[in-house]
């Protein structure tokens, strides 16, 4: 039961953690202009990964992409990079973590590759997240640093009468959307990473054993046990008192020399 | 067609208040910021504050913070200047203006002359 | 708060001749985010309320004659009308879009030589 739930709610808290990741790549606020100085005014400026928009008082907004590659700073790409790396793991951490789900059956899928796939979908969540994580931090610290730059030469003046204002840019939106949702997918990722644990098989050091009297055929299969969730039967922990019939899950188990005493 | 329709000429003693209106129609009145003008007998123009009608947000020429109110009733399009302690100095004529794109002005009405006289 | 200032105070211009309005703001108007100019032109005749004629700078309104030009950057801008004709007797402002308090030139009077 526990690792079912804690399996689900890894699967949720990571489809939430993308979607924000996504939401996060798209929003055009990853630094608004700074208004400590002007704290109303009629030009308000922001800007995204791929575009930069202007906010007029009119309630005109006008934004315009960044219509180029080479012109643009290497750190700006390496942030885009670096959310779309996060994007696609994320994306492919949730299809594998759809058919890793306990509670969805998918043919004759064995436990063990179930515990696989939850694996594989959490180390994907993790880096997902950490991409975002990082992505989001390079953009914040490129940020900062043209921030202080900015305020060091704020007015270029001419003679002392005429002020060129140059606008400054702090933390936008974004910024914290893609720090809380590359968290949520972090923390999605580990709940998978946990729950695999609780999903995968324990390995028996030694094999069943058969135990035949006359006319009856007793079957007792020691050890073998998996960590119950609570749901369903424990079908590999039966024993059978009924002259050869086997499970399904015993016909899997062939007989070795070592199975007749 | 847009037009911006003001109330009448207004005769007041110092001290008192004046409610000057500006009736819009031909357009989206939420959709647009309405600006208030002074203007006085053969001087410039003098910008009072701007008036967001969607939400009521108001900014003020520092000169007016405290004397003029602008207000806007979204039910009727209709834009509103307060402006408060009337003074003979306030003897101008008054224009309601639309904001659009570029912070330009471009529909304007005919304005309000308001006299202050004892 | 942003001053503008324009010059000359008043002109006359031959019919057919050529305008030249100069208008100086105390701080720049352009906007790194757009790169464009926030300075707004304005026509105004006796009696009559403004007319606006350029935004941006340089940008003309619609229905406005393509005799009236702006150009400028920054701090330093020009209204001209290329062939001045009777209709354009007027005063002309200009008026800062950038920032609040939103500022206006003290007008320049155009008149006919």
């Known amino acids: 039961m526990a690792v079912t739930a804690c399996q689900g709610l890894g699967f949720v808290v990571s489809l939430i953690g993308i979607a924000g990741i996504i939401a996060a790549t798209c929003m055009d606020q990853w630094s608004t202009q700074d208004l400590y100085n002007n704290p109303v005014t009629a030009v308000f400026n922001y800007q995204g990964l791929w575009r930069s928009c202007v906010r007029e008082s009119s309630g005109f907004t006008e934004c315009r992409g960044y219509f180029t590659l080479l012109g643009l700073p290497a750190m700006l790409q390496a942030v885009r990079a670096l959310m779309i790396v996060g994007i696609v793991l994320g994306a492919i951490g949730l299809l594998v973590s759809i058919f890793a789900l306990k509670c969805i059956r998918i043919g004759s899928m064995e436990d063990s590759a179930k515990a696989n796939m939850t694996l594989t979908s959490g180390i994907m969540f993790i880096v997902s997240g950490l991409c975002a994580i990082a992505g989001v931090s390079v953009f914040a610290n490129m940020l900062v640093t043209n921030f202080w730059m900015s305020t060091a030469n704020m007015y270029t003046g001419m003679g002392g009468m005429v002020q060129t204002v140059q606008t400054r840019y702090t933390f936008g939106a974004a910024l914290f959307v893609g720090w809380v949702a590359g968290g949520l997918t972090l923390i999605g990722g580990v709940m998978m990473c946990i729950a695999c644990r609780g999903l995968a098989p324990e390995e028996t050091n030694y094999k069943a054993v058969s135990y035949h009297a006359s006319g009856h055929s007793v079957a007792y299969k020691p050890g073998g046990f998996k960590a119950s969730t609570g749901f369903g039967s424990n079908t590999k922990n039966k024993k059978i008192y009924d002259g050869g019939a086997r499970t399904e899950d015993e016909v899997q188990s062939y007989p070795s020399k070592h199975d007749y005493v | 067609q847009v037009q911006l329709v003001q109330s009448g000429a207004e005769v007041k003693k110092p001290g008192a208040s004046v409610k000057v209106s500006c009736k819009a129609s031909g357009y989206t009145f939420t959709s647009y910021v309405i600006n208030w003008v002074k203007q006085k007998t053969g001087q410039g123009l003098e910008w009072i504050g701007e008036?967001?009608?969607?939400?009521?947000?108001?900014y003020y020429s520092e000169k007016f913070r405290g004397r003029a109110t602008l207000t806007a009733d979204k039910s009727i399009s209709t834009a509103y200047m307060e402006l408060s302690s009337l003074r003979s100095e306030d003897t101008a004529v008054y224009f309601c203006?639309?904001?659009?794109?570029?912070?330009?002005?471009?529909?304007w009405d005919q304005g309000t002359t308001v006299t202050v006289s004892s | 708060d942003i001053v503008m200032t324009q010059s000359p105070s008043s002109l006359a211009v031959s019919l057919g001749e050529m305008a030249t309005i100069n208008c100086k703001s105390s701080q720049s108007l352009l906007n790194s985010g757009n790169q464009r100019n926030y300075l707004t032109w304005y026509q105004q005749k006796p009696g009559q309320p403004p007319k606006l004629l350029i935004y941006?700078?340089?940008t003309r309104e619609s229905g406005v004659p393509d005799r009236f030009s702006g150009s400028g950057s920054g701090t330093d801008f020009t209204l001209t009308i290329s062939s001045l004709q009777a209709e354009d007797v007027a005063v002309y402002y200009c008026q800062n879009s950038y920032n609040y308090p939103y500022t206006f030139g003290q007008g320049t009077k155009l008149e006919r030589k």
């Open positions: 941006w700078a340089s």
């Open positions: 008036i967001h009608p969607r939400g009521g947000n108001t």
């Open positions: 203006a639309r904001l659009r794109r570029g912070n330009a002005m471009d529909y």
